[in-house]
């Protein structure tokens, strides 16, 4: 799997979208974890709701929020109020029992705001290594901007 490099401004929100095969991953919870070292374990940050029907509901751990659109096959992770300490290697995972399948590896880089409190607008562009592999990001100066998800049936 290629690693997608995503950059975000300190103090703002970074949104990561990992896409997956909705049929293949039907009924599976998704998780966002932080990799400890190059070959180290991936430490769970947050996972979607235990009731798969309710995977579209936002679940949070501190400033990290996850929600899964199981119909579209897109799990969205939002890192709010991005800090320098949030930089690092992460994974989107699909959980089946105790096993975790990696959907996407994401390297998060945190940039200091060069405009110093001025509105950065939509100037930010994600840098990608090799291929985007289904991961996308939205960068917004509005910290409250969230995605709505359709019903899961």
């Amino acid at each position: 799997l290629n690693t997608t490099v995503l950059q975000g401004m300190a103090g703002q929100s970074l949104r990561v979208s990992c896409t997956y095969d909705a049929l293949k991953h039907w009924g599976r919870r998704k998780a966002w974890c932080r990799q400890l070292g190059e070959e180290g374990p991936c430490q769970r940050v947050v996972s979607t709701h235990g009731v798969w029907l309710l995977a579209f509901l936002k679940k949070r751990n501190g400033s990290t929020v996850i929600a899964d659109d199981t119909l579209a096959g897109t799990v969205t992770i939002t890192l709010k109020n991005l800090q320098a300490g949030d930089a690092g290697l992460y994974q989107c995972q699909s959980l089946r029992g105790r096993e975790a399948e990696v959907l996407q590896k994401v390297l998060v880089e945190v940039l200091e705001d060069p405009l110093d409190d001025q509105d950065a607008g939509d100037l930010w562009v994600p840098e990608e290594s090799s291929s985007f592999e289904g991961a996308q990001v939205e960068h917004s100066t509005s910290r409250n901007q969230e995605t709505s998800f359709p019903p899961t049936s």
Epitope: G50, K58, S148
Partner: antibody, heavy 124, light 106 residues
């Protein structure tokens, strides 16, 4: 106003099945999930499962897996909870409760409207 | 499964006094916690959700606080209609209720 009206009390023998209904009114039935929660005499509340009235998808607590079936009839805005292989410890009041809507990604969720409950007595 | 523990099991309070009920989760549930009131022979009634947001129509004397694993429901000045059983519920991962706290007249 939003209301959940449940079926009447039932007395069943061990091994039998019971089907409890919950008729919703005052809101768009297919826009909110429905939970079932039970309460044994003098005991606390126990979550049993959830149904999506729109598509009919369900998710059950592990304890009730294989014994409970939740269904819905969109034409009458009614959800049903059927519990089979009844035993004396299933004697309880069974509640339906409205869960989260899915028109928006919610920050927090809860069970905001409850039926009055249906008493199910299992006795030989 | 996340286990919810409420304390005390019974709280004896005089009308007009403050009541403080505690709820502890076996692991973090963020702020996905609700409080319900239940009177004998009645269904539970939603009081608080999101740990601290009052449900529609709930009087201001009811307030909730806490996040993670420790939560509190406070009734600032108990009225006669507040004597009941109170349950906390986590909705962060599946759904589990605490064992309840009975608030009785002292």
């Amino acid at each position: 106003q939003v209301q959940l009206v449940q079926s009447g009390a039932e007395v069943k023998k061990p091994g039998a099945s019971v089907k409890v209904s919950c008729k919703a009114s005052g809101y768009t039935f297919t826009s909110y999930y429905m939970h079932w929660v039970r309460q044994a005499p003098g005991q606390g509340l126990e979550w049993m499962g959830i149904i999506n009235p729109s598509g009919g998808s369900t998710s059950y607590a592990q304890k009730f897996q294989g014994r409970v079936t939740m269904t819905r009839d969109t034409s009458t805005s009614t959800v049903y909870m059927e519990l089979s292989s009844l035993r004396s410890e299933d004697t309880a009041v069974y509640y339906c409760a409205r869960g989260p809507g899915y028109t928006t990604a919610l920050d927090y969720y809860y069970m905001d409207v409850w039926g009055k409950g249906t008493t199910v007595t299992v006795s030989s | 499964e996340i286990v919810m523990t409420q304390s005390p099991a019974t709280l004896s309070v005089s009308p007009g006094e403050r009541a403080t009920l505690s709820c502890r989760a076996s692991q973090s549930v963020s702020s996905n916690l609700a409080w319900y009131q239940q009177k004998p022979g009645q269904a539970p009634r939603l009081l608080i959700y999101g740990a601290s947001t009052r449900a529609t129509g709930i009087p201001a004397r009811f307030s909730g606080s806490g996040s993670g694993t420790e939560f509190t429901l406070t009734i600032s000045s108990l009225q006669s209609e507040d004597f009941a059983v109170y349950y906390c519920q986590q909705l962060d991962d599946w759904f589990t209720f605490g064992g309840g706290t009975k608030v009785e007249i002292k």
